[in-house]
């Protein structure tokens, strides 16, 4: 749902560098050989130095002289290495083994006209705890020109993604160009630049709780109802909806454009006895921004007359006539609001 974004490769928004580490910290990539040097002057020469890994008292070494060589280090070797002389601590050498971050793929969205834009990235593998992300941004508007700023990004363990909020006030008409910088102690990577317009980017979440049900006595009707997504507040901005439906065996949809703020609709031309796929999508009433994604598919089948068995076992009841076949069916069921059929049928 980010087809409205554009790349601006030529603009450099900020310098994306590896993170500084505390003085004396040794950094390494996994698999490397690392030399740790006990920092005290007294550790020089041929003295016997005792080393302990702070993460576990079981890992100990004794060296003659002040250097400890660790081969094929792994992420789990990260920690403090304590060197001691005569059972007294001489120094601590912090080791940080890390993997450089992967190149982030940034996507930005704004789910309603009242909220900030959110830019996020879901790494393909869990980043190391030391990995940090920052969003470099340039705001371009007609009045104030350009302004550069940075936004800190939080990593959510639950969502497994980095997320950054770009402040946009209601009614703002501004362009933003953004780039995500992800860095840790052994490397850094920037995403491609993404550009978005504060209003044009608005894209609601798909409508929620779509229900498709048969209407008794109506073999070609389907009643469809839904609700606005949780992320949309209909007391400020209304939504318009499109509904599309098709028989399960068809690829072609019939699309209906519905009046603003209508949360239900009756399909009148469903095929008898056939299961149909139905979806709905929403957009701000004044065509602000983008259509939402289509809601997940929900299926429904129109009402089917159940044949009654006579005592003789004959499967026919001449009095059972569908309402649809009667002359005055308009009066039998409250007529639904008229919908405009657009682009019907649509091949998707």
């Amino acid at each position: 749902h980010h087809h409205h974004h554009h790349h601006h490769h030529h603009l450099v928004l900020g310098s994306c560098r590896a993170l500084e580490v505390a003085n004396g910290t040794v950094t390494s990539l996994p698999g490397a050989t690392v030399t740790l040097i006990c920092p005290g002057k007294e550790a020089a020469g041929n003295v016997t130095i005792h080393w302990v890994y702070s993460g576990s008292q079981n890992r100990e070494w004794t060296t003659t002289g002040n250097t400890l060589v660790l081969r094929d280090v792994q992420l789990s070797d990260t920690g403090d290495y304590l060197c001691s002389l005569n059972d007294h601590l001489v120094g601590t050498v912090p080791l940080l083994v890390d993997v450089p971050p992967e190149e982030p793929k940034l996507s930005c969205f704004r789910k309603n006209p009242l909220v900030n834009a959110i830019c996020e990235w879901r790494p393909s593998s869990t980043p190391s705890p030391t990995t940090k992300a920052v969003l470099f941004a340039k705001k371009i508007n007609t009045t104030n020109g350009k302004s550069d700023f940075q936004v800190p990004c939080q990593y959510s363990q639950q969502l497994k993604s980095f997320s950054c909020q770009v402040e946009i006030l209601e009614g703002d008409k501004v362009y933003h160009i953004v780039s995500l910088c992800v860095a840790n102690s052994v490397g850094s990577k920037s995403s491609h630049n993404e550009a978005f317009h504060s209003l044009k980017m608005v894209q609601p979440d798909p409508p929620a709780n779509l229900v498709v049900s048969a209407i008794p006595g109506r073999p070609r009707w389907l009643k469809v109802s839904w609700q606005h997504p949780e992320t949309w507040d209909p007391s400020y901005y209304l939504l318009q909806f499109q509904l599309r439906y098709r028989p399960v065996w068809s690829k072609e949809f019939t699309v209906l454009l519905l009046p603003v703020a209508q949360y239900q609709c009756v399909i009148h031309d469903a095929l008898r006895g056939v299961k149909h796929v139905v979806q709905v999508r929403g957009k701000e009433e004044l065509d602000l921004g983008q259509w939402s994604e289509w809601s997940p598919e929900v299926t429904g089948t129109p009402w089917i007359a159940e044949p009654r068995t006579t005592p003789a076992g004959i499967l026919w009841n001449p009095t059972q006539v569908s309402v649809e076949d009667s002359a005055n069916h308009e009066d039998q069921y409250e007529s639904s609001t008229e919908a405009t059929s657009v682009l019907a049928p649509v091949q998707e």
Epitope: G40, K41, E42, G45, V47, V52, S54, Q57, L82, S84, L85, N86, D87, H88, L89, V90, G91
Partner: antibody
Framework: QSLEESGGDLVKPGASLTLACTAS?????????MCWVRQAPGKGLEWIGC???????TYYASWAKGRFTISETSSTAATLQMTSLTAADTATYFC??????????WGPGTLVTVSS | DIVMTQTPSSVSAAVGDTVTINCQAS??????LTWYQQKPGQRPKLLIY???TLASGVPSRFKGSGSGTDFTLTISDLECADAATYYC?????????FGGGTEVVVK
């Protein structure tokens, strides 16, 4: 092997004093930590600083920096120079060689009294 | 500087009792902690180094435990000779730091 402090005295506020720590049965040249600790009457132990013998490596408590200086004067002696003494510096001053598992040696201490 | 906080400042117990002295460091000192015993008018005597290793000649009634920031000295089967002041000490030459001391009175 033993250590002995000397030079403790009664001095006036503002005076300077140098204490000596002499080793018997071993020499400093093998690279020891020689440390000075003091104890005011009826109070606890307070670390002043250490020198790693055979080098110029010295460490001091933050309160002692500038006013106290530890030096190695020979292969068997170390000194503690104290300046601008006040009544709060009145204490027994110990020198110690602490080698953990290889033994721990403290002198008997020498008393410094600062009084007008 | 690292601060070593010792509790209690004084404890009274009968012969045969067990006494526990606590020492807390203001930051992680791993296992680099020493315990000393000092009797009035005497120099300090090393009891335990590296938090739990008994120094030569020290009875096994003395036991040190802990690592990181929290340490304990336990004296079991208390004897009259154990009446003294006990000090914990951060064991790093670049910065020794003593606790305030715990006076053990044997009744």
């Amino acid at each position: 092997q033993s250590l002995e402090e000397s030079g403790g005295d009664l001095v006036k506020p503002g005076a300077s004093l140098t204490l000596a720590c002499t080793a018997s049965g071993f020499s400093f040249s093998s690279g020891y930590y020689m440390c000075w600790v003091r104890q005011a009457p009826g109070k606890g132990l307070e670390w002043i600083g250490c020198i790693y013998t055979g080098s110029d490596t010295t460490y001091y408590a933050s309160w002692a920096k500038g006013r106290f200086t530890i030096s190695e004067t020979s292969s068997t002696a170390a000194t503690l120079q104290m300046t601008s003494l006040t009544a709060a510096d009145t204490a027994t001053y110990f020198c110690a060689r602490d080698l953990g598992s290889r033994g721990n040696l403290w002198g008997p201490g020498t008393l410094v009294t600062v009084s007008s | 500087d690292i601060v070593m906080t010792q509790t209690p400042s004084s404890v009274s117990a009968a012969v045969g009792d067990t006494v526990t002295i606590n020492c807390q460091a203001s930051e992680n000192i791993y296992s680099f902690l020493t315990w000393y015993q000092q009797k009035p008018g005497q120099r300090p005597k090393l009891l335990i180094y590296r938090a739990s290793t008994l120094a030569s000649g020290v009875p096994s009634r003395f036991k040190g435990s802990g690592s990181g920031t929290d340490f304990t000295l336990t004296i079991s089967d208390l004897e009259c000779a154990d009446a003294a002041t006990y000090y914990c000490q951060r064991n790093a030459y670049s910065s020794w730091a003593f606790g305030g001391g715990t006076e053990v009175v044997v009744k």
